[in-house]
């Protein structure tokens, strides 16, 4: 079934933009003018996943790359990564719940929580350039509090 | 205070175009996914489509190839372009914003504005 | 596309009355629907979404239940300011949200 989607960029609460950093891993930095062009656009689809009232099931694909975030198991701790799919089946509305986070709205600010692993969600650091990463705690040093930006093409 | 007002409706022939708009006071549309939803008279509600961003737009699917919805955030507004229009598209046209991106749903509306088609 | 099917049509209450009002969808929807109440010449306003969540200030004696194909809005006491028209709204389906054709709640 086609799913709805969007283009979008993110942003921590910082005001950190996400970019590339190496071909599997996302890093959050402050950006400026012409620099704003690094930040990475997503395509973010609604898909199928558990109800919950505020909880929106979302996957977070790179737009035009076979790349979607996903969350996994890595040394027995929830881990965060880009991982390749086949462009020709995805966007899907049933994605595996490894690509599917519950996206969270409240006063136009966003948080993507981790289906597969409840209570865990995307975060950045307070510190200039460091991964993007699955982090287990909410309002302590990290963030996981976002704003979204659409993308015009 | 929040709002959002619709213009630019009116009588219009059979056959031809008209293009509404939707402006929003008290917040920006700029990340506001916005809905255009119908109503003819003494009528049900139909659902027209909807943006997301500028490339991103999903329509009912008797509105693909007749109605465009697209938008300009320098001017706040969403528009709703229709062509060919037909009897059957008198109707109350309102613009609707959904709650939170991807909800489905429409917590805030405009007043709606009148589109005759009548020869 | 999905189908929504609205019963009963019109419904004629007193103040004071329950009212149930019922939406079926033609394919499960999980808990991806919405309630909407109109009043003549006025825009739609919001009651609940996700089945059962009221939206920001509707009074408690609206209800919603109900999940996959089968919903339903309660009223628990109606007032003078309930008569109006009620839109089922399917929020989930695809590319696609449709509405239901309303029940009019009427003074009986």
């Known amino acids: 079934a086609p799913v709805r989607s969007l283009n979008c960029t993110l942003r921590d609460s910082q005001q950190k933009s996400l970019v590339m950093s190496g071909p599997y891993e996302l890093k959050a930095l402050h950006l400026q003018g012409q620099d704003m062009e690094q930040q990475v656009v997503f395509s973010m689809s609604f898909v199928q996943g558990e109800e919950s009232n505020d909880k929106i099931p979302v996957a977070l694909g790179l737009k035009e790359k076979n790349l979607y975030l996903s969350c996994v198991l890595k040394d027995d701790k929830p881990t965060l990564q880009l991982e390749s799919v086949d462009p020709k089946n995805y966007p899907k509305k049933k994605m595996e719940k490894r690509f599917v986070f519950n996206k969270i709205e409240i006063n136009n600010k966003l948080e993507f929580e981790s289906a597969q692993f409840p209570n865990w969600y995307i975060s950045t650091s307070q510190a200039e350039n460091m991964p993007v990463f699955l982090g287990g705690t909410k309002g302590g040093q990290d963030i996981t509090d976002f704003t979204m930006q659409f993308v015009s093409s | 205070e929040v709002q959002l007002v619709e213009s630019g409706g009116g009588n219009v022939q059979p056959g031809g175009s008209l293009r509404l708009s939707c402006t929003a006071s008290?917040?920006?549309?700029?990340?506001?996914?916005m809905a255009w939803v119908r109503q003819a008279p003494g009528k049900g509600l139909e659902w027209v489509g909807i943006?997301?961003?500028?490339?991103?737009?999903y329509y009912a699917s008797w509105a693909k190839g007749r109605f465009t919805i697209s938008r300009d955030n320098s001017k706040n507004t969403v528009y709703l372009q229709m062509n060919s229009l037909r009897a059957e598209d008198t109707a109350t046209y309102y613009c609707?914003?959904?709650?939170?991106?991807?909800?489905?749903?429409?917590?805030?509306w405009g007043q709606g504005t009148l589109v005759t088609v009548s020869s | 596309d999905i189908v929504m099917t609205q019963s009963p049509s019109t419904l004629s209450a007193s103040v004071g009355d329950r009212v149930t009002i019922t939406c079926q969808a033609s394919?499960?929807?999980?808990?991806?629907l919405s309630w909407y109440q109109q009043k003549p010449g006025k825009a739609p306003k919001l009651l609940i979404y996700?089945?059962?969540t009221l939206a920001s200030g509707v009074p408690s004696r609206f209800s919603g239940s109900g999940s996959g194909a089968e919903f339903t809005l309660t009223i628990s006491s109606l007032q003078p300011d309930d008569f109006a028209t009620y839109y089922c709204?399917?929020?989930?389906?695809?590319?696609?949200?449709?509405f239901g054709q309303g029940t009019k709640l009427e003074i009986k």
């Open positions: 609707a914003r959904e709650r939170a991106i991807f909800s489905g749903d429409f917590a805030l």
């Open positions: 008290g917040f920006s549309l700029s990340n506001s996914a």
């Open positions: 943006i997301y961003d500028s490339a991103s737009t």
């Open positions: 394919q499960s929807i999980s808990s991806y």
């Open positions: 996700r089945a059962s």
């Open positions: 709204q399917n929020t989930g389906g695809g590319i696609n949200i449709a």
